[in-house]
């Protein structure tokens, strides 16, 4: 029996019972908040043998093993993930072993085993033998192993039955429980699983299996499950489903869902019956079960019930974010706000049409309405009273509508309406006039030239860079000297740069009046020559990188024909030098005969130019004398050489600060204080646990459906 | 935890007409599959019908394709099984079922099952 699509059992402990008749669980299984310690004795599930997603298990009160639960549960597929981990084991209060005897194989993912404050038999368990990495796995604050004690079966009575193997450079015996070996496969068998009396399975299984290489005889699939067969690819008109099984076209059309895009069923695509169409990919018509690729992003339609979409917050734009096509009309009105611009652009820059008008008013948080990057089409189905489909109202701050030599919006339908926009030149809104199509439309009122552009520097004159000279991290430039009317008039000039990887930066980018600006911004006073050209020196800046500088002039509100006027530069992108690139990462090295070395590496994480090749250098090195010191015939523990491997063991690090004999007369010494590198690694690993924990309340944590 | 309590069952003529009803405590009973199962006497549980949290998909079993209808009202919490022409064939015990996010056609073990309603069809 298939149980499904995912299972959580929480509050209830008798809502264990949902388990009774599952093999397999297609999805995830929750075990969680159950506060109150029963007794789970009376509760067994031997038939449950596969989880295809992951186990998850926290704060369950009064459970001491999942052995008894899951006798049989022999693998956890990790076809989906919780945060990266298949099995995660968090804050189990009263957890003595884990248990699952019958555990073989977690097919991908890690595993998290956390705050369980009982918790043995945690290192006498090779999860080696169960993940393919183990470099993942996140086994940390559990009860520590000297105070567990764990005994593997028969090594007290001198007569060990479990095998051993090596972890951490530890030859040990691996079990689960006092009473559990933990089973492995004879070494002939390689990566193929097998029974209980090691002979080995069928190369399709996974696990386990009741009979040797018989792909029906599967405790589960390595690839796939098909008519009772474990097979290693679906066979022709069958398609994968949830990562472990083939299933048919009727029975993919008729999987019902109580999500939001079920209307149209699941579909097929690239051998594999799911959900929806992937990422870049579009039904091939409305009832159709096939994809198509989409040309650009692909469509997404949204729609308000109320017809009209106020825009106030970040809050009330994420509710847009992947929209293409808005139906309805959109009333933007954002007075304050952090990173106001890039946050809009994030939840909003993929619109393409509003089917109804456009309303930006009061938003004195905006400088620019490029957030709405993508928008090409304003239908005007719908109009404000007046007939207007773009409607543009006191807006303190608004100096940019678009960027209008890369940009075509075509409003349909309806008029534009423009006031009260003191920074907003007029010449920008006859502009939006003409790439529109609206000229014409609008009547002597709609676009006030009194009260629209009265505070900003509409008459433009252009600044001109003279020289630029770079180095691998400084840039100095100079630009002709402006001259306004009135020369008293002229304050000082702002530089502007930031990095650019690409040419198509705007003055408005990530910019709003709230004090977010992506740009940086440096005051250049006026040369006290007057033939002096001006120029600056940035400083600072990353080698091998291409930046954006621009230049404005800072003037008075000199007025003519009730405009100020201004000067400012093109956008001049410009490279700082090529300079040493930071070292190669990760280097490794092995000897794969007596007369060779294999040595790999990453490349630097700032190559800071094109790396054209590598130097490797090396040298012969004297043998070390340390390991002639020790006889390895003797019995006692063989001295073991640690090397650092970049992480930090956390249990290690909470212990009492160990002494160690420094070698001579100098006697016991303290622990070494913790270096700087050590410091850091310890602070990433407190956030990284915050990140999970917030990630698994805010996954778990929900309001009562009743 | 969901409750389900069915209604409508009872005694009716060959070829006649009976709907069954399906009251759920859950708020959130659009995120849930809703389904009809039946068992005869003496014979084991069948899948009926399955409708989408939605309203908009349905599955029917061959045997009642047809003449059965399923249908549900988000807004007042129920699950319908409206039952035209009915045949002897018909009599069981029809439970309605309930399973969140999703319903795969081989789908038996639902999340939450109510007790039971009892429709006979006969003369």
């Known amino acids: 029996e298939i149980c499904g699509p995912g299972i959580d059992i929480r509050n209830d402990y008798q809502q264990l019972k949902r388990l009774e008749n599952c093999t397999v669980i297609e999805g995830y299984l929750h075990i969680l908040l159950i506060s109150k310690a029963e007794d789970y004795r009376s509760y067994r599930f031997p038939k449950l043998t596969v989880i295809t997603e992951y186990l998850l298990l926290f704060r369950v009160a009064g459970l001491e093993s999942l052995g008894d639960l899951f006798p049989n549960l022999t693998v956890i597929r990790g076809w989906k993930l919780f945060y990266n981990y298949a099995l995660v084991i968090f804050e189990m209060t009263n957890l003595k072993d884990i248990g699952l005897y019958n555990l073989r194989n977690i097919t991908r993912g890690a595993i998290r085993i956390e705050k369980n404050a009982d918790l043995c038999y945690l290192s006498t368990v090779d999860w080696s033998l169960i993940l393919d990495a183990v470099s993942n796995n996140y086994i940390v604050g559990n009860k520590p192993p000297k105070e567990c004690g764990d005994l593997c079966p028969g090594t007290m009575e001198e007569k060990p039955m479990c095998e051993k193997t090596t972890i951490n450079n530890e030859y040990n015996y691996r079990c689960w429980t006092t009473n559990r070996c933990q089973k492995m496969c004879p070494s002939t068998c390689g990566k193929r699983a097998c029974t209980e009396n090691n002979e080995c399975c069928h190369p399709e299984c996974l696990g386990s299996c009741s009979a040797p290489d018989n792909d029906t005889a599967c405790v589960a699939c390595r690839h796939y499950y098909y008519a009772g067969v474990c097979v290693p690819a679906c066979p022709p008109n069958t398609y994968r489903f949830e990562g472990w099984r083939c299933v048919d076209r009727d029975f993919c059309a008729n999987i019902l869902s109580a999500e939001s895009s079920d209307s149209e069923g699941f579909v097929i695509h690239d051998g594999e019956c799911m959900q929806e169409c992937p990422s870049g990919f579009i039904r091939n018509g409305s009832q159709s079960m096939y994809c198509i690729p989409c040309e650009g992003p692909c469509p997404k339609v949204c729609e308000e019930e109320k017809k009209t979409k106020t825009i106030d917050s970040v809050t009330s734009a994420q509710m847009l974010q992947g929209c293409t096509i808005f139906k309805g009309n959109l009333l933007i009105n954002i007075r304050r706000g952090n990173n106001i611009a890039s946050e809009l652009e994030n939840f909003m820059g993929l619109i393409e049409v509003v089917t109804g008008y456009v309303k930006i008013r009061h938003s004195h948080a905006l400088v620019s309405l490029s957030f709405l990057k993508n928008l090409r089409l304003i239908l005007g189905e719908e109009q404000l009273e007046g007939n207007y489909s773009f409607y543009v109202l006191d807006n303190q701050n608004l100096q940019q509508l678009w960027d209008w030599d890369h940009r075509n919006l075509t409003i349909k339908a309806g008029k534009m309406y423009f006031a009260f926009n003191p920074k907003l030149c007029v010449s920008e809104i006859y502009r939006m006039e003409e790439v529109t199509g609206t000229k014409g439309r609008q009547s002597k009122g709609d676009i006030n030239t009194r009260n629209n552009g009265e505070r900003a520097s509409c008459e433009s004159d252009v600044l001109h860079f003279t020289s630029t000279t770079t180095s691998k991290n400084r840039i100095i430039i100079t630009w002709h000297r402006y001259r306004p009317p009135d020369y008293r008039d002229l304050i000082s000039f702002t530089v502007y740069y930031k990095e650019a990887p690409f040419k198509n930066v705007t003055e408005y980018d990530g910019q709003d009046a709230c004090g977010s600006n992506s740009w940086n911004m440096v005051d250049v006073d006026l040369p006290p020559n007057k033939d002096v050209e001006p120029g600056i020196l940035l400083h600072g800046l990353k080698p091998w990188t291409q930046y954006a500088v621009y230049v404005k002039a800072v003037t008075l509100t000199m007025v003519e024909n009730d405009h100020i006027r201004g000067a400012k530069s093109e956008i001049l992108y410009i490279r700082t030098n090529a300079s040493v690139p930071s070292i190669p990462l990760d280097v490794l090295s092995a000897s794969n005969s007596s007369s060779q070395l294999i040595v790999k590496w990453n490349p630097p994480s700032l190559p800071n130019g094109n790396l054209s090749y590598y130097i490797v250098r090396w040298q012969r090195q004297p043998q070390d004398g340390y390991l002639y010191r020790h006889n390895y015939c003797s019995k006692d523990k063989i001295p073991i050489r640690k090397y650092a491997d970049g992480t930090i063991d956390i249990e290690e690090v909470t212990e009492n600060p160990k002494t160690e004999v420094c070698g001579g007369e100098k006697g016991p010494c303290c622990a070494c204080p913790k270096t700087e590198a050590e410091k850091q690694a310890e602070k990433e690993e407190a956030e990284y646990r915050k990140v999970f924990e917030n990630f698994l309340h805010n996954s778990i944590f929900v309001p009562r459906p009743e | 935890e969901v409750q389900l309590v069915e209604s409508g069952g009872g005694l009716v003529q060959p070829g006649g007409s009976l709907r069954l009803s399906c009251a759920a405590s859950?708020?959130?009973?659009?995120?849930?599959?809703m389904s009809w199962f039946r068992q005869a006497p003496g014979k084991g549980l069948e899948f009926v019908s399955a409708?989408?949290?939605?309203?908009?998909?349905?599955n029917y079993a061959d045997s009642v394709k047809g003449r059965f209808t399923i249908s549900r009202d988000n807004s007042k919490n129920t699950l319908y099984l409206q039952m035209n022409s009915l045949r002897a064939e018909d009599t069981a015990v029809y439970y309605c079922?309930?399973?969140?996010?999703?319903?795969?056609?081989?789908?038996?073990?639902?999340?939450?099952w109510g007790q039971g309603t009892l429709v006979t069809v006969s003369s």
């Open positions: 079922a309930a399973n969140p996010r999703r319903a795969t056609p081989d789908l038996t073990q639902y999340a939450y």
């Open positions: 859950s708020r959130t009973f659009s995120s849930f599959v």
């Open positions: 409708i989408s949290g939605s309203g908009s998909r349905a």
